[in-house]
């Protein structure tokens, strides 16, 4: 309930918000949660923390984890997890769905796409944008202030849009980059009962003990823009909200609009340094619109490392 | 600059629900919480509760426990306080508050009548 | 709950003259914490939303003239208008900012003589 998912790439800055809030007065405590190690305050630290803010300047893969803030208070403490995972830098331009931030739609009189998490850094203007991985170049294209504005919006703009700025930390510079989906609102739709694509019924699904594992639900709706659509992830037939493990968040993924217009759904369950007994967890993709509710099962096998021997 | 401003005035009957918005601008929305006051006629201020903008966790004072229902959407800047079972003595001036040291910033208030 | 009392109920003050206002708690309004009073003080005009003029017993909202200050801890505080102008002419209110739920003062209506 009181935990949040963070993630960044290394070597980028990467500053993560307590879950709760409080009084600015309050003070924060924050620790790494695998060893009860304190998260020091001074900013000599590469990772610091500063109030509300954890700072990792700049981030690195091994900082992943879950990290504790408590908020203290006159009358209580208050308790939130941070859940940071830092991926290792892509080689290609594919940005993977664990990295991205919640999809926003567009139509030809709205078509602002904001840079996710920017307000939690000291950045200035102005703000670099890229789609699929290409510098964004031409009139239609207006960086203002933390989000860009495209004139005259078509199908083809649709799309991933990376932003990318510089965060400054007593003088030190960082970058960071953010990528979010970008789909154009078909006028003309219609709904169907919900085609779950990913993952497969029953399937079981290998993972490594002590490793991070993603599960993607992802379905489909119809066509255009859905009155009602959703796709979740559920833990023995419980909400993953009330079912109290941090380390398994779920997380909106990309909503998509394929050439064919149809209207999908993803949803990303990241389970944090998997254990045993995650193993017996019965994991439920659901998706349900105005149709009516799908869902399909999904198992954890461990999967066995491979065998070097000559 | 931050401002607050806040749904229009209602007049409800008694057992009906009233909902107000109360929407942000001028700084990040989830870095503070929201809480809601209310003002009757002649009478004290009265806190109703809060809510951690952030993750959607509210927080509600013992008087209101189930009748009210605060909510938030991030996307929209908003905060929502809904009071349901309406009563006479639920007549009052509404405020939203934003959360710090002190309450710094309020919203302008939505006069809730309840009257048969 | 934290109650709040406020004396007196209204108060009637020439001109250039000091107005004093009083708030008591039920509990001590200190957390040893940070040492800070959770503690503030607004004024209202009729119409108008609170205007928060101190917090933490004694800090001045920024904006706020230097005629208005607050004093006190624990349970017992103080708010001072060292020289009352005819705009100061407003209910106040102090309020505990310390522990839910949130508690106000009945408040004080200062007008002038």
């Known amino acids: 309930k009181f935990s949040k998912q963070s993630w960044g790439l290394e070597n980028e800055a990467l500053i993560v918000r307590c879950p709760r809030q409080g009084k600015p007065s309050y003070t924060v405590d924050w620790y790494y949660s695998q060893t009860n190690k304190s998260i020091p305050t001074q900013e000599r630290n590469r990772v610091f923390a500063s109030g509300q803010l954890l700072k990792f300047l700049p981030a690195a893969v091994a900082d992943s984890g879950i990290y504790t803030c408590i908020v203290r208070s006159p009358t209580f403490n208050r308790t939130g997890y941070a859940n940071v995972t830092i991926y290792k830098k892509q080689s290609d331009c594919n940005v993977p769905d664990y990295l991205m931030y919640s999809t926003v739609s567009g139509s030809e009189k709205n078509s602002k796409i904001y840079c996710p998490t920017i307000d939690l850094y000291n950045w200035t203007a102005p703000l670099e944008w890229f789609k699929n991985c290409q510098a964004l170049q031409g009139s239609r294209y207006r960086a203002h202030k933390s989000f860009l504005v495209i004139d005259n919006v078509m199908t083809e703009d649709a799309g991933d849009y990376t932003c990318k700025f510089i965060h400054n930390e007593n003088g030190a510079n960082y970058s960071v980059t953010a990528t979010r989906s970008f789909t154009v609102k078909d006028e003309q739709g219609f709904s169907l009962f919900p085609v779950i694509g990913a993952p497969a019924q029953n399937e079981i699904k290998e993972v490594e003990i002590g490793k991070n594992a993603n599960l993607t639900c992802s379905a489909c709706f119809g066509k255009g823009t859905q009155f009602l659509a959703a796709v979740l992830w559920q833990l023995n037939g419980t909400k993953i909200t009330d079912f109290g493990e941090p380390r398994i968040q779920q997380e909106e993924g990309q909503n998509q609009s394929f050439s064919n217009g149809l209207a999908c759904l993803d949803m990303v369950l990241r389970i944090a340094d998997v254990k045993e007994e995650d193993l017996l967890l019965q994991y439920d993709c659901l998706a349900l619109n105005l149709h009516g509710l799908r869902r399909h099962t999904v198992r954890l096998s461990r999967k066995n490392p491979i065998d070097h021997h000559s | 600059q931050v401002q607050l401003v806040q749904s229009g005035a209602e007049v409800k009957k008694p057992g009906a629900s009233v909902k107000v918005s109360c929407k942000a601008s001028?700084?990040?929305?989830?870095?503070?919480?929201m809480n809601w006051v209310r003002q009757a006629p002649g009478q004290r201020l009265e806190w109703m509760g809060w809510?951690?903008?952030?993750?959607?966790?509210?927080t509600y004072g013992d008087n209101f426990k189930g009748r009210v229902t605060i909510t938030r959407d991030t996307s929209a800047s908003t905060a929502y306080m809904e009071l349901s079972s309406l009563r006479s003595e639920d007549t009052a001036v509404y405020y939203c508050?934003?959360?710090?040291?002190?309450?710094?910033?309020w919203g302008q208030g939505t006069l809730v009548t309840v009257s048969s | 709950d934290i109650v709040m009392t406020q004396s007196p109920d209204s108060l009637a003050v020439s001109l250039g003259e000091r107005a004093t206002i009083n708030c008591k708690s039920s509990?001590?309004?200190?957390?040893?914490?940070?040492?800070?009073?959770?503690l503030a003080w607004y004024q209202q005009k009729p119409g108008q939303p609170p205007k928060l003029l101190i917090y933490?017993?004694?800090t001045r909202e920024s904006g706020v003239p230097d005629r208005f200050s607050g004093s006190g801890s624990g349970t017992d505080f103080t708010l001072t208008i060292s020289s009352l102008q005819a705009e100061d002419v407003a209910v106040y209110y102090c309020?505990?900012?310390?522990?839910?739920?949130?508690?106000f003062g009945g408040g004080t209506k200062v007008e002038i003589k």
């Open positions: 508050a934003r959360e710090g040291d002190g309450f710094a910033y």
């Open positions: 001028g700084y990040t929305f989830i870095n503070y919480g």
């Open positions: 809510i951690n903008t952030y993750i959607g966790e509210p």
């Open positions: 509990q001590s309004l200190l957390y040893s914490g940070n040492q800070n009073n959770y």
């Open positions: 933490g017993a004694s």
């Open positions: 309020q505990n900012d310390h522990s839910y739920p949130y508690t």
